[in-house]
């Protein structure tokens, strides 16, 4: 019940092997790992097709799979203690060999939301249907099986082995047999690409022991990203066949000499490589060696090439790939610089806006300008900020320090202001006297006056009306007598003196802020300007990127 029959497909820089045998996911991963691989990833539709091909190869050889549905482990797992995450394409699962999550997925059905047990993914094959590229195997999630109890395990698994490069298959110019042995211990006589470090055994002849000659080759890295066998000329050539056997093993043209010998040649625009078999384009750019948006530029006489990057990008150490230039390293902005792919943009601190001499310059925002002042009364602009002040008789108030509130001088902590009665008004106060007393010229003391039964003298009339316009806390005038020890009205309430300084308490905001400011509590977005190269002007991302999308499929997260 180990891993039995296997099939292999090599493409790009990876080989996929398919195995039958009832193993748990852990045992299957261990089997792949022993040979230097992992359970396979399926990160794209193309990769899904490669995996499907290797499974089709396995199923052609494997008569034992009689079940209608068959499952094969791949390297997608969710650890114990990690809940399903429906907002992600991989639903909280991850590839066992590591690597980034990719958007491709092909789930068989809505997943069960579980958090407790480890969950593993297998490819679900319907063996009653032909395997078509348009009908790729679905992903099925379930328990990971138990080592040593085949009943709980599934039919097989797929491994993936990655390599730095591949050699072309060896071309035979006459009868013979090639056997490739890969670094992951698979032997095959038909690979469309042969992985780096594979060995090739070539037995020439038609089976006659006398005529058999053997050759041994190794797939080596001849130059960076160039892999070949180190062989020269077609193998197993025979004058008996000339160019008639497998085109003499030649990649393109085969030219016969009169003596049964032959040579390989290439079509116009191509040149023969050192193996004397393979043809490559004379234009080195035809193989698209440049990556990441780089353009391939032919060198003089079309012999070599260089890669060129678009504005805002530069070549990396391989000289083949483009990476973003961090223009902010050169401090091109007066205040804040934000690097963007292929460019950058300048931002101004809160309290500043784009403007002034030079690119990326910032100028102070005059928060106190007509029509935009956030202050209820006085406003003083400062560099990058502002502060509010209040008129006499008012103090700054409000959470953000932009409002003004009347000071009730009649109840302040400064002791008696009036000898008798005190009347608070908007921004001021007045003294008054009890019946039978009159206010002295100093406006504070009371002197005995003619007996009168009228109201207390001195309440304010309309003289203050509108004195403190802009105050957000209007108050009615109030008389505040204080009781004396015997219960009779005492001369005055305790009040505070009016402030004689109009700029007394002020609120200021720090100059440099990348957080909301202005006056505290007044939010302003950073100003943005000056974009270069690939990036146009953009607002900083608003809203909340972490808000997940609403899913209403009503499935309650079933398996």
């Amino acid at each position: 019940t180990g891993a039995d029959t296997e099939a292999v497909v090599c493409v790009g820089t990876a080989c996929y092997t398919a195995h039958s045998g009832k193993l748990s996911a852990a045992e299957a991963q261990n089997h792949c790992n022993q040979n230097g691989g992992n359970l396979a990833t399926v990160k794209s539709k193309e990769e899904a097709q490669h995996v499907q091909r290797v499974l089709a190869q396995l199923l052609r050889r494997e008569a034992a799979l009689t079940a209608r549905m068959s499952k094969f482990w791949i390297g997608l797992q969710r650890e114990k203690g990690k809940c399903l995450d429906p907002s992600l394409p991989l639903k909280g699962f991850s590839w066992v060999g590591g690597g980034e999550d990719t958007p491709y997925s092909n789930w068989h059905k809505e997943l069960r939301n579980s958090c407790i047990s480890k969950r593993c993914v297998s490819l679900l094959l319907d063996l009653s249907q032909p395997l078509l590229p348009s009908r790729l195997p679905k992903w099925s999630e379930g328990p990971c099986g138990s080592p040593g109890s085949p009943g709980s395990n599934i039919e097989g698994f797929v491994c993936k082995f990655s390599f730095k490069g591949m050699c072309r298959p060896l071309a035979l110019g006459g009868p013979g047999q090639v056997t490739y042995t890969t670094p992951f211990q698979t032997t095959s006589s038909s690979l469309e690409a042969v992985p780096f470090a594979s060995a090739a055994n070539v037995a020439c002849g038609e089976g006659d022991k006398d005529e058999t000659q053997s050759h041994y080759f190794l797939c080596k890295e001849k130059a960076p990203d160039v892999f070949d066998w180190g062989s020269s000329g077609p193998l197993c050539v025979s004058p008996k066949y000339g160019c008639n056997f497998n085109n003499g093993g030649c990649h393109q043209d085969c030219f016969e000499g009169g003596d049964g010998s032959f040579l390989c040649g290439c079509r116009p625009g191509f040149r023969l490589l050192d193996d004397l078999v393979t043809c490559a384009s004379r234009n080195p750019c035809s193989s698209s060696p440049c990556r990441g948006g780089a353009t391939c530029v032919l060198g003089p006489h079309g012999k070599n090439y260089t890669c060129r990057c678009p504005q805002g990008y530069q070549l990396d150490s391989s000289q083949l790939d483009c990476v973003d230039v961090d223009e902010c390293q050169d401090s091109p902005c007066a205040q804040e610089c934000v690097n963007t792919p292929g460019g950058f943009r300048c931002e101004c601190w809160v309290g500043y806006e784009p403007g002034g001499p030079g690119e990326g310059a910032c100028q102070d925002v005059d928060e106190c300008a007509l029509g935009r002042s956030p202050c209820a009364q006085g406003c003083t602009n400062t560099d990058g900020s502002f502060h509010c002040s209040c008129e006499e008789g008012y103090v700054l108030a409000g959470e953000d320090g932009t409002q003004c509130q009347d000071v009730d001088e009649c109840v302040g902590p400064g002791g008696p202001l009036c000898d008798s009665l005190c009347f608070n008004t908007q921004g001021s106060f007045h003294c008054g006297c009890l019946p039978g007393w009159v206010l002295a010229p100093n406006g504070v003391s009371c002197t005995m006056g003619p007996v009168s039964l009228g109201p207390p003298s001195g309440p304010p009339d309309e003289e203050d009306k509108g004195e403190k316009e802009g105050s957000t806390v209007p108050r009615a005038a109030t008389a505040s007598p204080t009781r004396g020890p015997e219960g009779t009205p005492k001369a005055t309430p305790t009040t505070s003196r009016p402030s004689l300084s109009s700029d007394a308490p002020i609120t200021s905001a720090p100059l440099k802020m990348l957080a909301p400011s202005g006056s505290p509590g007044v939010w302003r977005e950073p100003s943005i300007h000056h974009a270069t190269a690939a990036s146009g002007p953009q607002e900083p991302a608003g809203g909340d990127s972490s808000v997940a999308t609403q899913n209403n499929d009503g499935t309650d997260g079933q398996k």
Epitope: K80, G81, K82, C83, L84, D85, P86, S87, L88, G92, R112, N113, S114, C115, I116, S117, K118, P143, S546, A548, T549, Q550, N551, D556, G557, Q558, K559
Partner: antibody
Framework: QVQLQQSGAELVRPGASVKLSCKAS????????MHWVRQTPVHGLEWIGG????????AYNQKFKGKATLTADKSSSTAYMELRSLTSEDSAVYYC????????WGQGTLVTVSA | QAVVTQESALTTSPGETVTLTCRSS?????????ANWVQEKPDHLFTGLIG???NRAPGVPARFSGSLIGDKAALTITGAQTEDEAIYFC?????????FGGGTKLTVL
């Protein structure tokens, strides 16, 4: 429709054990985890633990390790929670709830621990 | 163990939109916390509303929605109805256990 039917109220002595049951119907029992939660006036809702009936895998709140044991019987579609070494602090209403999203709840079992 | 905090009480009017939040003492709530929202009506009747941050349970009206707002999980009732008066609990998953919040008593006047 989905139903979780819990066993009846229990009056138990301090130090004793009790086994509560939660019978599931209206869905495939092994398709969803079963979680257990208790409610008291002092601590509100407390998650005790959960079980995956398909694999028997469990997870527990550290506070209830050694106090609660969760099991599941696939043949009868019933989840069980055994509570041992009971004290007056364990007097509560105990609930089973289906799946890690707590979509469906049983009616609750009142457990009273009293001498 | 982590502490999960909810508003103790909120009041809304029929037809209004109200948002209940759920904060974690360990930092920002993310989708890996798999936030669940549960409604408790009188006589200990519990109903699951939202699971896994933003998935409505079967049969739950569309006016209930779950999301992440800033560093908290949120339950929004768009157009509250008098029958939505209840206690709402959130529960967050922390790698191997759930922790419930203290509940929010929602009054619909």
């Amino acid at each position: 429709q989905v139903q979780l039917q819990q066993s009846g109220a229990e009056l138990v002595r301090p130090g004793a054990s009790v086994k509560l049951s939660c019978k599931a119907s209206g869905y495939t029992f092994t398709d969803y985890e079963m979680h257990w939660v208790r409610q008291t006036p002092v601590h509100g809702l407390e998650w005790i633990g959960g079980i995956d009936p398909e694999t028997g895998g469990t997870a527990y709140n550290q506070k209830f390790k050694g106090k609660a044991t969760l099991t599941a019987d696939k043949s009868s579609s019933t989840a069980y929670m055994e509570l041992r070494s009971l004290t007056s602090e364990d007097s509560a209403v105990y609930y089973c709830t289906r799946g890690a999203w707590f979509a469906y709840w049983g009616q609750g079992t009142l457990v009273t621990v009293s001498a | 163990q982590a502490v999960v905090t909810q508003e103790s009480a909120l009041t809304t009017s029929p037809g209004e939109t109200v948002t209940l939040t759920c904060r974690s003492s360990t930092g920002a709530v993310t989708t890996s916390n798999s936030a669940n929202w549960v409604q408790e009506k009188p006589d200990h009747l519990f109903t699951g509303l939202i699971g896994g941050t933003n998935n409505r349970a079967p049969g739950v009206p569309a006016r209930f929605s779950g999301s992440l707002i800033g560093d908290k999980a949120a339950l929004t009732i768009t157009g509250a109805q008098t029958e939505d008066e209840a206690i709402y609990f959130c529960a967050l998953w922390y790698n191997n256990h759930f922790v419930f919040g203290g509940g929010t008593k929602l009054t619909v006047l």
